[in-house]
């Protein structure tokens, strides 16, 4: 269970308990909310008792015997109200949440395009990256623009495992590697020299790179080839 | 009079103190029950090896698994027999792929490979059944009537299926449903 919320309420408590108004999103959160209320109440109780102990002598000096009792009753009354609210919250909320969860899970099951996490709908997630697996064929430059319009980059491959995975998903696709001519080095989209072996590099006409089943090949930048986009999480 | 007032206040504070204590113990019990309920309530457990993502109506997959439409898929690069594949998926707290529809794996639709899926023929029910015991929809693979019932089914994500000896080695796909 994520106890961050509890730690937060212990250490970084704001002057007034507005956090309690936050709507719990789920069962876990509703319990956290209640824990925060309790922690806040306990902190207030400690503070109040400290105040009371500190001012004890002055009350007696002024000879107002009912004042401390009134203060205690007031504090206890507030604590009772808070505790009562907590009990009601904990009794009422889970049942409505379960109901809501059951309804939403029914709805979600019927949706076709459910999607995961931080990736756009219809993208796939793999090893902390989102991938748009395109089916359309484009030139290298068109592919670059298409990915940019999707707030992502033309496919880049960081390691062997990712390359093998992408080769399984799709037999060939553009990658974000190019050169200005055969006399220039292959570079990535951020201008770094690209050292991985690219087959057919000696052909002066082929200045854009393609992933093709576990190897990289050079291709004509004007060829229409499937493209994929990538966005690191 | 002052003494009476003091006694009254003490009585009230005593009563409130007792109420506070009882409310506190009630709250403690309720919290304990809620946590217990949380740990055994299946509706709230996202499943093995999966962690809930923050700010998400969905969940994240294990490393080296693909997340797509709230499912996690393990796409093997190794080739195994159908039974080996089934056991490997089970060891990952998942099962061999059960298809809801033929475009379920449309992110792999340009793949040329065939993969073992969780479909086998039940002599007892005289029907093709998925791993969970549900029957194969006749609309999923139009050619399923021609499948050899002694064989297992390999599927290509562009929608084709074929029957092969269960002892043949193929790649396989495991699936974990997150919802």
């Amino acid at each position: 269970m994520d106890n961050q919320g509890v730690i937060y309420s212990d250490l970084n408590l704001p002057p007034n308990p507005k956090r309690q108004q936050r709507k719990p999103k789920g069962n876990k959160n509703s319990i956290l909310a209640t824990e925060q209320e309790i922690t806040y109440a306990e902190l207030n109780l400690q503070k109040a008792s400290q105040d009371f102990q500190g001012n004890d002598k002055t009350y007696h000096c002024k000879d107002l015997p009912s004042a401390p009792e009134k203060l205690i009753v007031g504090i206890l009354g507030i604590i009772c109200l808070i505790l009562m609210a907590s009990v009601v919250t904990i009794v009422v909320i889970p049942s409505t949440l379960i109901q809501r969860h059951n309804n939403s899970s029914l709805n979600t099951r019927t949706q076709k395009a459910r999607h995961c996490g931080h990736c756009p709908e219809e993208w796939i997630t793999y090893s902390n990256s989102c991938y748009y697996i395109g089916k359309e064929r484009r030139t290298w430059e068109e592919s670059l623009l298409a990915c940019t319009s999707k707030n992502s980059s033309l496919l880049s491959i960081d390691n062997e495992e990712e390359m093998k995975f992408l080769s399984i998903i799709s037999p060939s696709s553009w990658i974000g590697v190019f050169r200005n001519s055969s006399h220039h080095p292959w570079v990535t989209m951020n201008g770094l020299a690209f050292k991985h072996e690219i087959k057919d590099s000696d052909n002066a006409e082929l200045n854009c790179a393609v992933l093709q089943v576990n190897r990289l090949k050079s291709a004509q930048c004007g060829s229409s080839i499937i493209y994929h986009c990538k966005h690191k999480l | 009079m002052a003494v009476f007032k003091t006694t009254l206040w003490r009585l009230i504070s005593g009563t409130l103190g007792i109420i506070c204590l009882s409310l506190m113990s009630t709250l403690g019990i309720l919290l304990k029950n809620s946590f217990t309920k949380l740990s055994i309530e299946p509706a709230f457990t996202p499943g093995p090896n999966i962690e809930l993502q923050k700010d998400s109506d969905c969940c994240s997959c294990q490393e080296k698994w693909v997340g797509y439409r709230c499912n996690c898929y393990f796409i093997s690069s190794e080739q195994k027999t159908w039974n080996e594949s089934r056991h490997l998926c089970a060891s990952q707290k998942s099962s061999l792929l059960q298809l809801q529809n033929t475009d379920e794996l449309d992110f792999m639709s340009s793949s040329q490979q065939f993969y073992w899926i969780g479909l086998s023929y039940s002599e007892e029910h005289t029907a093709w059944l998925w791993e969970n015991g549900s029957a194969l929809s006749q609309y999923l693979f139009p050619s399923f009537e021609t499948f050899n019932t002694k064989n297992c089914i390999a599927y290509n994500p562009n929608g084709n299926a074929l029957d092969e000896s269960c002892e043949d080695k193929n790649r396989y796909i495991c699936k974990q449903q997150l919802i």
Epitope: N159, E160, M163, H184, P185, K195, H196, E197, S201, D202 | -
Partner: antibody, heavy 121, light 107 residues
Framework: EVQLQQSVAELVRPGASVKLSCTAS????????MHWVKERPEQGLEWIGR????????EFAPKFQGKATLTTDTSSNTAYLQLSSLTSEDTAIYYC??????????????WGQGTLVTVSA | DILMTQSPPSMSVSLGDTVSITCHAS??????IGWLQQKPGKSFKGLIY???NLEDGVPSRFSGSGSGADYSLTISSLESEDFADYYC?????????FGGGTKLEIK
Amino acid sequence: EVQLQQSVAELVRPGASVKLSCTASGFNIQNTYMHWVKERPEQGLEWIGRIDPANGDTEFAPKFQGKATLTTDTSSNTAYLQLSSLTSEDTAIYYCGRERYFYGSRGFAYWGQGTLVTVSA
Amino acid sequence: DILMTQSPPSMSVSLGDTVSITCHASQGISSNIGWLQQKPGKSFKGLIYHGTNLEDGVPSRFSGSGSGADYSLTISSLESEDFADYYCVQYAQFPWTFGGGTKLEIK
């Protein structure tokens, strides 16, 4: 076609320096790493070092640090090995090699034909 | 430095035989090994990279295997052009180091 062309032989005096060249064709040296290896009949093969022609970064075997200098000229697609303060121990065949580098797998796919360096008075 | 111990230093074999040459590294090298061929008076040619992968144009009778610190090159059904010197090279860490070589001779 990938080729690495080296000069055939060099005869040099002890204490002098020599600069060996390795001209590549069929690929751009900036896209790979260029290595140099020393071969002597009794000692076998010894790796001297490598250079990244894209930025001039070098790695050396400890015994060749100070003895060998690696440079490149990207305009002529050529890698150079300079050996200084030559002694009879430096008499050997020197090979240049192109590193194959591809997502975790390395190796030498292509080699020059070697330059025989003879240090003699 | 990683020491590469190659064996045997030489072997006499017949055409059609299957031979294995082994290399032992002084520490684990995680398949970061290549195998090279050198014909008399000629330069080197890469045969195998990353322990098991064949370089382009290398016949399939050559194969590499092994893990950890022990690796081998196997040549099945030897042909006349296979009689040459063979070396292993490790590239797990700098400096790269070579085995002492194996001379394959016709019996």
